[in-house]
Interface confidence: low
């Protein structure tokens, strides 16, 4: 509204008059009139400072658009009627505090607040940076920002933060890694971090195992396994204690017996070999290396079951050039043997009775030449021969030829045999079996108690001229020993040979009865004696043990025996008791 | 919180060379394994590189002698220099982290064109 | 190198219907402090690959329980409960227990 002019006050006191001046004007009395002055914070609308136009108006004046503003730097200004008001953005702060207006005392000026000098402003496990008007906080190394914390950082979960072989032990803030036993660092130092040292295993197999073992080195470890044949004290197979020993183990002493029956254990240091008992050889499907070493019964003899027990006719099959001395033994020997080897050819070999035995032949023609050798060199001859008619003979009823012959007669030899396959069926039945003019009788019992496996079979041999080379003076009394100025003895019969499959060869509960042929009629005053060849003397001998006489006539002899085996009878004349 | 962002793709010329960035927040380089897989275009992922906690360095066979991981603990910034650039090292490559248990924390990937 | 087989590499399933994924190592995943460092990851189209699993059976943080982790030695499955909309994408296993890292080929699961 436009205020009325009015006349002054000529008395000097205009100001009384409150409508003068407009608001937030102050009005001031002059000598003879007065004027009107807007307030501090306000501007008069004509722009002059003192004014009595009633149409002049006092306006604010804002103090905070004014440039630079009147707070200063880092603050924030508020305009208000007549004035303003001062207060310091948030991080920073004045001496005279906030909401400064002009007239309170002191300087309003707004600094940073160190807010890390407040301990709790940042949390556990970080770092506070100040900055101007702010701050922050950043996680100390091992540490990781998770929902305003600071959270431990497990290093040990990273596949890699240490090297194989160590341990990672979490720490706060932190971690190490320690190499496991048996490891060393290759830094030298006990704990490490990362990947720069590495966990190098230690050898302990330099001096921990004892003799006879084997150390094998493990990571971070070592055992000690005793060698093959040797077994440890603390009876652990595989040991790391420093006192146990490794002993050898006596493979023989086993029960049953490592090598299995029929066989012959040698121990040795660590070791052991197997071998068989006679009549027995090393089944060749097995073997002691593979653990499966068995013996199996010879069926029949061959060139390497004859060998072993006699040393001349090893030196025959040396390889080496044979000693002149022994070139005709050898001649002999080697004419037997390579009979025998075609019969031992291999196990499909079909053996004809008649052939082989016709083979025999030669041999027997040049008996006669034996008598220029030593007495150990016919009758190692002689147990061959006599050993490898009998193998022949076993061997045709091993692998018999398509047309069996049950009876080879020749000029030097006879031989007749029988396989067993009905014949034995009812009881108390006895065999009889004839070779030249000298026969064999023997009971089914006997034949069963041998104890054959598969095809049973007998047979009986007799020998023209053998007795000629065999003679007297081969004979061996095993109850006494005889010297010739009290007798004379002479033998007097072609030697026989009584063959059968079985395994048993003496020992019979029933006798087997030979009746031998005499080559010259028997006088009064002899006396026969039944012979058995034994291979147990010397390359081998005559002796009476296992036969009695049954029977004694002019033209033949009935021997008792109880055994299988070749024989002959030698008479004896002058003072010879015999029971 | 945790944020991996990579940077310094482009197109370049076969033989050329290039440098990817991939700068590290909310955690130290020194507490995890930081690797680079990459995806060349229709194809599965390829890992490439890695500079383990400790500092040591492995790499693909593909990129062995040619490529070098490499970090600045102080700008926690890991770094995969590029070398003797072939056709087939086009792909997105992402920065990732062993973070407590595997890649958990990847970059958004930056695309790397090798072309004439 | 560990080569990782996965299989099948495409996956078609109804929602709601079960899935799994198989993944064969060609070596023993198993590190020698013990762990046996086996993930598997998800990268949805235009994402970068997020972890499901890590150590064979372990859910990473914010993963639904339907998703469950197996296996041992070289032979490892993945398995989904129930598979919903959102779980289309390739999904990735990798070895970190030997240096260098391998992945899988990757499996396209895709709703039918």
């Known amino acids: 509204h436009i205020r009325p002019t009015r006349k002054p006050n000529t008395k000097g006191n205009n100001c009384r008059d409150s409508t003068l001046c407009p608001a937030y004007a102050t009005c001031t009395n002059t000598v003879d009139s007065y004027y009107c002055a807007c307030k501090q914070g306000f501007l008069s609308s004509n722009g002059q400072n003192h004014f009595k136009d009633p149409g002049v108006r006092c306006k604010d004046i804002d103090e905070c658009s004014q440039s630079p503003q009147p707070c200063g730097p880092n603050s924030s200004c508020k305009n208000l009627s007549g004035r303003y008001k001062c207060s310091c953005l948030d991080g920073f702060s004045s001496p005279t505090g906030n909401d400064w207006v002009p007239g309170k005392p002191g300087n309003f000026s707004c600094t940073d607040i160190n807010e890390c000098l407040t301990s709790s402003v940042c949390p556990e496990h970080s770092d506070c940076v100040n900055s101007m008007g702010s701050y922050s906080c950043s996680c100390q190394v091992g540490f990781i920002s998770r929902n305003s914390t600071c959270e431990d950082v497990d290093e040990c979960a990273d596949p890699r933060a240490c090297p194989e072989h160590a341990t990672c032990n979490n720490t706060v803030g932190n971690y190490s890694c320690f190499c496991n036993p048996g490891f060393e660092s290759s830094s030298g130092h006990l704990s490490f971090q990362g990947l720069k040292a590495s966990c190098e295993d230690i050898d302990e197999c330099t001096e921990m195992c004892p003799i006879n073992s084997t150390c094998t080195n493990t990571p971070g470890s070592y055992f000690c396994t005793c060698h093959p044949g040797f077994a440890p004290s603390n009876g652990q197979l595989n040991f790391t204690d420093q006192g146990v020993e490794c002993r050898d183990i006596d493979e023989c002493r086993q029960d049953p017996s490592t090598c299995g029956p029929n066989s012959i254990c040698t121990n040795a240091l660590g070791s052991y070999s197997c071998g068989c008992i006679a009549g027995f050889h090393p089944n060749p499907e097995g073997s002691q290396k593979d653990g499966n070493f068995s013996c199996q019964r010879v069926l029949f003899k061959c060139k390497e079951d004859v060998i072993p027990d006699n040393k001349q006719i090893q030196q025959c099959q040396e390889g080496t050039a044979v000693k002149p001395a022994y070139v005709s033994f050898c001649a002999q020997i080697n004419n037997i043997f390579s009979v025998l080897d075609k019969v031992c050819e291999n196990k499909t070999t079909v053996v004809s009775l008649k052939n082989t035995t016709e083979s025999f032949v030669p041999v027997l023609k040049q008996i006669s030449t034996w008598t220029k050798f030593t007495k150990e060199e016919t009758s190692s001859l002689a147990t061959v021969f006599l050993e490898s008619v009998e193998s022949m003979t076993l061997a045709s009823f091993w692998k018999p030829s398509a047309n069996i012959t049950p009876a080879v007669r020749t000029e030097y030899l006879d031989i007749e045999s029988k396989v067993i396959n009905k014949e034995c069926s009812e009881e108390n039945v006895t065999l009889d079996l004839v070779a030249k003019g000298d026969k064999m009788k023997i009971g089914c019992s006997t034949i069963e108690e041998s104890e054959s496996t598969e095809t049973t079979g007998v047979a009986f041999v007799s020998f023209v001229g053998m007795e000629s080379v065999l003679n007297e003076r081969f004979f061996k009394d095993h109850q006494a020993p005889l010297t010739t100025s009290e007798i004379k003895l002479k033998m007097n019969s072609r030697v026989v040979g009584g063959i059968m499959t079985g395994e048993k060869k003496d020992g019979f509960s029933d006798p087997i009865i030979y009746t031998l042929e005499n080559i010259q009629p028997k006088q009064k005053f002899e006396r026969p004696i039944c012979v058995s060849w034994s291979t147990d003397v010397k390359g081998g001998r005559w002796t009476s043990f296992g036969c009695v006489i049954l029977e004694a006539s002019e033209t033949y002899t009935i021997c008792s025996c109880n055994q299988m085996a070749n024989l002959a009878v030698i008479m004896a004349s002058g003072e010879l008791t015999m029971d | 919180q945790v944020q991996l962002v990579e940077s310094g793709g482009g197109v370049v010329q076969p033989g050329r060379s290039l440098r990817l960035s991939c700068a590290v927040s909310?955690?130290?380089?020194?507490?995890?394994?930081m690797h680079w897989v990459r995806q060349a275009p229709g194809k599965g992922l390829e890992w490439v590189a890695v500079?383990?906690?400790?500092?040591?360095?492995y790499y693909a066979d593909s990129v062995k002698g040619r490529f070098t991981i490499s970090r600045d603990n102080s700008k926690n910034t890991v770094y995969l220099q590029m070398n003797s650039l072939r056709a087939e090292d086009t792909a997105v490559y992402y920065c990732?982290?062993?973070?407590?248990?595997?890649?958990?924390?990847w970059g958004q990937g930056t695309t790397v064109t090798v072309s004439s | 190198d560990i080569v990782m087989t996965q299989s099948p590499l495409s996956l078609p399933v109804t929602p709601g219907e079960p899935a799994s994924i198989s993944c064969r190592s060609s070596?023993?995943?198993?590190?020698?402090?013990?762990?046996?460092?086996l993930e598997w990851y998800l990268q949805k189209p235009g994402q970068s690959p997020q972890l499901l699993i890590y150590?064979?059976?372990n859910r990473a943080s914010g993963v639904p329980d339907r998703f469950s982790g197996s296996g041992s030695g070289t032979d490892f499955t993945l398995k989904i409960s129930r598979v919903e909309a959102e779980d289309v994408g390739v999904y990735y296993c990798?070895?970190?227990?030997?240096?260098?890292?391998?992945f899988g080929q990757g499996t396209r699961l895709e709703i039918k």
């Open positions: 150590r064979v059976s």
């Open positions: 070596q023993s995943l198993v590190h020698s402090n013990g762990n046996t460092y």
């Open positions: 909310g955690f130290s380089l020194t507490s995890f394994g």
């Open positions: 990732a982290s062993i973070y407590y248990r595997g890649f958990d924390v």
């Open positions: 500079i383990w906690s400790g500092g040591s360095t």
């Open positions: 990798v070895q970190g227990t030997h240096v260098p890292l391998t």
